[in-house]
């Protein structure tokens, strides 16, 4: 038992198994559920995290969908198929051969069909709106302080470049964080906005994915920011394709 084995952990994903059996005795961590090797210097993809989560399943959750093009994760948890890079495969199917197409954050963007359903490409979610309501405080937060603190959080905790935090809106008690990242803007090594939003969502729920860290302690000028509810809306580069029946 060496110091190397003590150090062989995954700071950014506690849903892993790590051992110093990589090339040259280096630490290597594999995601639970998929067994895929993960890069522990950055966020693990949402697809691999969902797959790991499904190896210890919890109850599904339901959110609200407010507009025709904004998608919300209404289908809750499922055991996804991930590609070799850990991204969602465009077509997802369940054990009963019901299939559907998803976007890059794994949210269904078509009606459900059978095994003949075709999903030609993985459509990128390029705009995410995180809608938060905070618990009552003595007074409203200063908008610029709140903006700076949330940008700092996304950079320092979720490794997301500040340029991808498009805006922070605030009308007490509602906070909206807009994340934008087009395919052309995302360079190799950049954290995906979908992954950052998922880590944030889990943090807000008190289900941190980080190894051995305390939960999220959000403060604005020393004042705790406690979130009562969260809704996340996903906008895709190509609008979703649902039948009219679903829209009525």
């Amino acid at each position: 038992h060496t110091a190397a084995q003590d150090n062989c952990t995954c700071p950014t994903n506690k849903m892993t198994v790590c051992s110093p059996d990589g090339p040259g005795g280096r630490c290597q961590c594999r995601a639970l559920g998929s067994g895929m090797a993960v890069d522990c210097s950055t966020l693990t993809s949402k697809c691999l995290l969902l797959k790991a989560r499904m190896s210890a399943p919890k109850n599904a959750r339901t959110l609200v969908r407010p507009s025709e093009h904004a998608l919300v994760d209404n289908d809750g948890l499922y055991d996804p198929d991930c590609d070799p890079e850990g991204r969602f495969k465009a077509r997802q199917c369940n054990q009963t051969s019901v299939c559907w197409c998803v976007n890059s954050v794994g949210v269904r963007r078509t009606d459900k069909g059978d095994l003949s359903l075709r999903c030609d490409e993985l459509v990128r979610t390029h705009h995410i709106l995180i809608d938060l309501r905070h618990r009552p405080t003595a007074g409203a937060f200063n908008h610029s302080d709140l903006d700076a603190e949330l940008r700092r959080l996304f950079r320092e905790r979720y490794r997301l470049h500040p340029k991808f935090v498009a805006a922070v809106h605030y009308e007490q008690p509602t906070i909206q964080i807009e994340l934008r990242q087009n395919t052309s803007q995302k360079a190799a090594g950049d954290v995906d906005i979908g992954d950052a939003a998922y880590y944030f969502e889990r943090d807000i729920k008190g289900e941190s994915l980080f190894q051995g860290r305390g939960g999220l302690d959000l403060r604005v000028r020393g004042e705790p920011l406690q979130v009562e509810r969260t809704l996340i809306y996903y906008l895709d580069e190509i609008p979703p394709k649902f039948s009219m029946k679903r829209l009525t």
Partner: antibody, heavy 122, light 109 residues
């Protein structure tokens, strides 16, 4: 805990070389970043590239270093820097340094090697 | 992104105080380190997180600031403080730009 660089010396223009950084008293299998930083004679410090030595081997490169410099870590005890198409402007002392955190965007260097001098001249 | 360090050189007597400033072109929160380098030696970490003293560094060294403006203050100057001082951040490393300031040479008279 110590770091030591090797592989420096005199190189001809357009030549290449490989620098190695070895650690003693600790293992390169932790959850931190190892960096190469250089300093031209009488000039300031500039980073070349870091590599994550935990699971994943992520790297970043300074804009000017992309394509000519390659950082790698093939074992739990060494990090290497390969440089190609060298010019006189690459003459410098090359340091390896250990980042103190696993977050590359919040890194500072708490352990440095003594440096190895690379001179590019015909 | 750029780190601008001023002045490039400063001279003060033993027992005096030196103030070095570092300005980031973008907000880097408190993610700034200060280093001391003497000729022929590698840099030595003095301060990290803008204001936290590294292990073994005397309390005469003080770091302050956040966001874009940072200061290193050395009080009760000693001859051993003669060195070049650098500020550094890795906050925007993914932009491929140098996170080191240009350096400040401190001469102790």
């Amino acid at each position: 805990q110590q770091l030591e660089e090797s592989g420096g010396g005199l190189v001809k223009p357009e030549g290449s070389l490989t620098l190695t950084c070895k650690g003693s008293g600790f293992d390169f299998s932790g959850t931190y970043w190892m960096w190469w930083v250089r300093q031209a004679p009488g000039k300031g410090l500039e980073w070349i590239a870091p590599i994550y030595v935990g699971s994943g081997s992520s790297t970043y490169y300074a804009s000017w270093a992309k394509g000519r410099f390659t950082i790698s870590s093939t074992s739990s005890t060494a990090v290497t820097l390969q440089a190609t198409s060298l010019t006189a402007a690459d003459t410098a002392t090359y340091f390896c340094a250990r980042g103190a955190t696993n977050n590359v965007f919040m890194n500072y260097f708490n352990l440095w090697g003594p440096g190895t001098l690379v001179t590019v001249s015909s | 992104f750029e780190m601008t360090q001023t002045p490039s050189s400063v001279s003060e007597p033993v027992g005096g105080t030196v103030t070095i400033k570092c300005q980031a072109s973008e907000d880097i929160s408190s993610n700034l380190g200060w280093y001391q380098q003497k000729p022929g030696q590698p840099p030595k970490l003095l301060i990290y997180g803008a204001s936290t003293l590294a292990s073994g560094v005397p309390s005469r060294f003080k770091g302050s600031g956040s966001g874009t403006e940072f200061t290193l203050t050395i009080s009760d100057l000693e001859p051993a403080d003669a060195a070049t001082y650098y500020c550094q951040t890795s906050y925007y490393i993914d932009d491929g730009v140098n996170g080191f300031g240009g350096g400040t040479e401190v001469v102790v008279k």
